[in-house]
């Protein structure tokens, strides 16, 4: 807390400019009007303030806006955003995607901080759902964002947003998350033809049920082993040797290298040895 002191003569700030970097903390507190600061927030980032000076500026904004900053100020916070606590951010009402982008840019290249997580949570809750533009933005900054959401949170993702999801965005998703996302993807891509559909749905297949895998096996999709290994164990187990052979196509030979790994191992155990022998891979049930 900076002590309240009168501003020295001639030091009253008329605008936010570089001369302020020479002000001591108490001078900033006494000589910079909070309302002026709020209207000229866009200038703060161009000035090399110290962390201590930024603390003073934050304090002035906190006094001016005890109920939370308006979006016009939030959009121009820049590096001052790094000084905000999750508690500060919970008071905000951020509705503009441009504001969100501006603040994410400040944190770019770093892991998602509690501040960023709170900001995103406030933004998404304010919108009511995770729309395509928001998802596009968030996954651009944080490829793992989608997989950081709980299955309950993912349920608010509309199928139309699934078009924004790239394969790498799903890399760290667990089975429960894919269980939620797969039906949405199936709905989103339902009007595509066979081969195009498979290219789009492939990343989501970790949530596919047995009947969908059986259907895919009839479409000459040639699923690669990496995708097959991510399928749900309970979805793979009922597949016959013939269905797996059709599903994998030329990649079926890869089963040998994965025979000790789940779900291949569990699937092999459940097959008749005579059926496995038809693959000619030396798999032992």
């Amino acid at each position: 807390e900076v002590e309240k002191t009168a501003c020295p003569s001639g030091k009253k700030a008329r605008e936010i400019d570089e001369s302020l970097i020479f002000y001591k903390k108490w001078e900033l507190e006494a000589c910079v009007d909070a309302a002026l600061l709020a209207t000229q927030m866009d200038r703060v980032n161009a000035i090399p303030f110290t962390y201590e000076q930024l603390d003073v500026l934050k304090h002035k904004l906190d006094e001016l806006y005890p109920q939370g900053y308006p979006e016009s100020v939030i959009q121009h916070l820049g590096y001052l955003f790094l000084k905000m606590s999750p508690e500060d951010i919970r008071k905000w009402n951020v509705t503009s995607l441009e504001t969100l982008k501006a603040l994410l840019e400040v944190n770019k290249g770093h892991e998602m901080s509690p501040q960023v997580a709170t900001l995103i949570d406030r933004f998404v809750k304010g919108r009511g759902q995770l729309d395509k533009d928001t998802l596009d933005t968030l996954t651009a900054f944080y490829p793992g964002y989608l997989c950081s959401l709980s299955p309950e949170e993912l349920s608010s993702v509309p199928p139309s947003s699934i078009w924004a999801v790239r394969p790498q965005d799903l890399d760290t998703c667990d089975p429960r998350q894919l269980d939620v996302l797969y039906p949405k993807a199936r709905l989103a891509f339902q009007n595509m033809n066979g081969s195009e559909y498979f290219v789009k749905i492939q990343s989501f297949l970790g949530g596919a049920p047995t009947e969908d895998l059986k259907a895919l096996s009839q479409q000459n999709v040639s699923m690669d082993l990496a995708t097959f290994m991510k399928l749900r164990t309970d979805a793979v187990l009922p597949l016959t040797v013939a269905e797996v052979q059709k599903l994998l196509g030329p990649h079926v030979e890869g089963l040998k290298a994965e025979e000790r790994h789940r779900p291949v191992r569990d699937w092999i155990l459940r097959q008749r040895q005579d059926d496995l022998d038809t693959l000619g891979l030396g798999l032992q049930g």
Epitope: D174, T233, R260, R262, D266, L269, G285
Partner: antibody, heavy 119, light 107 residues
Framework: QVQLQESGPGLVKPSETLSLTCTVS??????????WSWIRQPPGKGLEWIGY???????NYNPSLKSRVTISVDTSKNQFSLKLSSVTAADTAVYYC???????????WGQGTMVTVSS | DIQMTQSPSSLSASVGDRVTITCRAS??????LNWYQQKPGKAPKLLIY???SLQSGVPSRFSGSGSGTDFTLTISSLQPEDFATYYC?????????FGGGTKVEIK
Amino acid sequence: QVQLQESGPGLVKPSETLSLTCTVSGGSVSSRDDLWSWIRQPPGKGLEWIGYIYYSGSTNYNPSLKSRVTISVDTSKNQFSLKLSSVTAADTAVYYCARDFVLSGFDIWGQGTMVTVSS
Amino acid sequence: DIQMTQSPSSLSASVGDRVTITCRASQSISSYLNWYQQKPGKAPKLLIYAASSLQSGVPSRFSGSGSGTDFTLTISSLQPEDFATYYCQQSYDASYTFGGGTKVEIK
């Protein structure tokens, strides 16, 4: 519901063979969704998986114990068994049998039986 | 064999604390990771399977996350009955392996 019960001698002499049996009640050892495992825990130490068996007789063992371990299944008695040969004091442990449900993990365990290797 | 490394090996916490235990696999194990709780003189009890699925009958304060090589068990608000040793276990490879355990003690 399914319950497991280990049985066998609590004391085995060095160089001899440790033999334990696990009796499955309330369920079938022939279930297609289950693997039946043996796991041990030396006093004051962590858990070590020994091996599993499927009702068909397919087995898989811990590579570090493979040369000394045999796990077998008797579907008529609803039991599976462990044999560990050439035991030493390092094999002294609580031995657990457990069901490995394919869609989860070791969801049902026996209460464990302490086996001491000593002359 | 796939090595499973748990950290910390022990921790002290108070009732009501949020506790996080991590488990790292020496290679990717997809989501084939289970968590167990063991109390002295008792058999282990399955808490979480497939990295994040809560076993039936386990309180919702327990949660799991992770995929690939890094996994986390979180107890959102530690209860007196939660003081125990926790183990992770991979079932991706046919040679199952456990982590070394994390003992959660009363502070």
